[in-house]
Amino acid sequence: LPSCKEDEYPVGSECCPKCGPGFHVRQACGEQTGTVCEPCSPGTYIAHFNGLSKCLQCQMCDPAMGLRTSRNCSTTANALCGCSPGHFCIIQDGDHCAACRAYATSSPGQRVQKGGTESQDTLCQNCPPGTFSSNGTLEECQHGTKCSKWLVTEAGPGTSSFRWV
């Protein structure tokens, strides 16, 4: 292969000018002609100067996998996915998330000590003696002397399955 300049790409034993971001090569250059570039079609992109014959497919942000689109795809930049509401990222991959997980659900007998964020789970805490939380959604446990047995019983933390991006 020939050693081409940074703004060129190899074609056989020759070098041709690259296409700009948002364009792909429709026809390689010839002796008398430059590279023929064609715009990327909707749903595809190329972010850099390139010698590609096809644009790259935009990634899809699948809500079923706990994802939402945080940046729409353009012809010059791929879409970015973030975690959907109620989910947080457990593995980061560059500028996007490799795995989302649903927030833990605080159980009866627990309070929400700290709400979940984009990168952190909900933090649950057991209610202190003499207080209760009937559904685990409260930020403060309620004082009560007539709790039924099932409310006094300490419940384990909620669980939910991993959602991957």
Partner: antibody, heavy 115, light 107 residues
Framework: EVKLVESGGGLVQPGGSLRLSCATS????????MSWVRQTPGKALEWLGF??????????EYSVSVKGRFTISRDNSQSILYLQMNTLRVEDSATYYC??????WGQGTTLTVSS | DIQMTQSPASQSASLGESVTITCLAS??????LAWYQQKPGKSPQLLIY???SLADGVPSRFSGSGSGTKFSFKISSLQAEDFVSYYC?????????FGGGTKLEIK
């Protein structure tokens, strides 16, 4: 039930090649990033790389120690992950795990590189 | 690459005692940290993810804390089956590096 089963380990001479396989089941393979991790006899764990999921065009990422020598690929129709290892060195001797990091790992397959 | 420094490399303790293992990251990693347990001849098993969240089916005697660069992993009342090896792993940026491991031994 999620299952990952590695195979293909064995004894190879320095400079040789080998391909490891990881058969998976119990989840939608195309939705997940899949990784290879190795553990040397000295017990250190080393992340080798991953192949992204369908949404991310199955692109790959490698650690510096194996980049250019190892290639991760996947057969999505059979739900199999591969690790092609070329120009093997004595220091590549280890137990190799495929993983759906962080929650599911295979049982591992052992590679010995020795003359 | 982000270096993960895990300490101690080994620790002796008695049944019923509490132990704490520390992992220091060479740069800030938010809460993108996992802790694994590994039994002899077996693959690592996830105990904690996102620094503090307990993986499904893991007993509540295991807990994780910390964010940024300093992380701790605690076993509150050691059982016989806990005397094995433990590893941290950062999941902030590739390569997803591991700590050197901690081997727990019975006193």
């Amino acid at each position: 039930e999620v299952k990952l089963v590695e195979s293909g380990g064995g004894l190879v001479q320095p400079g040789g090649s080998l391909r490891l396989s990881c058969a998976t089941s119990g989840f939608t393979f195309t939705d997940y990033y899949m990784s290879w991790v190795r553990q040397t006899p000295g017990k250190a764990l080393e992340w080798l790389g991953f192949i992204r999921n369908q949404a991310n065009a199955y692109t790959t990422e490698y650690s510096v120690s194996v980049k250019g020598r190892f290639t991760i690929s996947r057969d999505n129709s059979q739900s199999i992950l591969y690790l092609q290892m070329n120009t093997l060195r004595v220091e590549d001797s280890a137990t190799y795990y495929c993983a759906r990091v962080p929650d599911y790992w295979g049982q591992g397959t052992t590679l010995t590189v020795s003359s | 690459d982000i270096q993960m420094t895990q300490s101690p490399a080994s620790q002796s303790a008695s049944l019923g005692e509490s132990v704490t293992i520390t992992c220091l990251a060479s740069q800030t990693i938010g809460t993108w940290l996992a802790w694994y347990q590994q039994k002899p001849g077996k693959s690592p098993q996830l105990l904690i993810y996102a620094a503090t969240s307990l993986a499904d089916g893991v007993p509540s005697r295991f807990s994780g804390s910390g964010s940024g660069t300093k992380f701790s992993f605690k076993i509150s009342s050691l059982q016989a089956e806990d005397f094995v090896s433990y590893y941290c792993q950062q999941l902030h940026s590739t390569p997803y590096t591991f700590g050197g491991g901690t081997k727990l031994e019975i006193k």
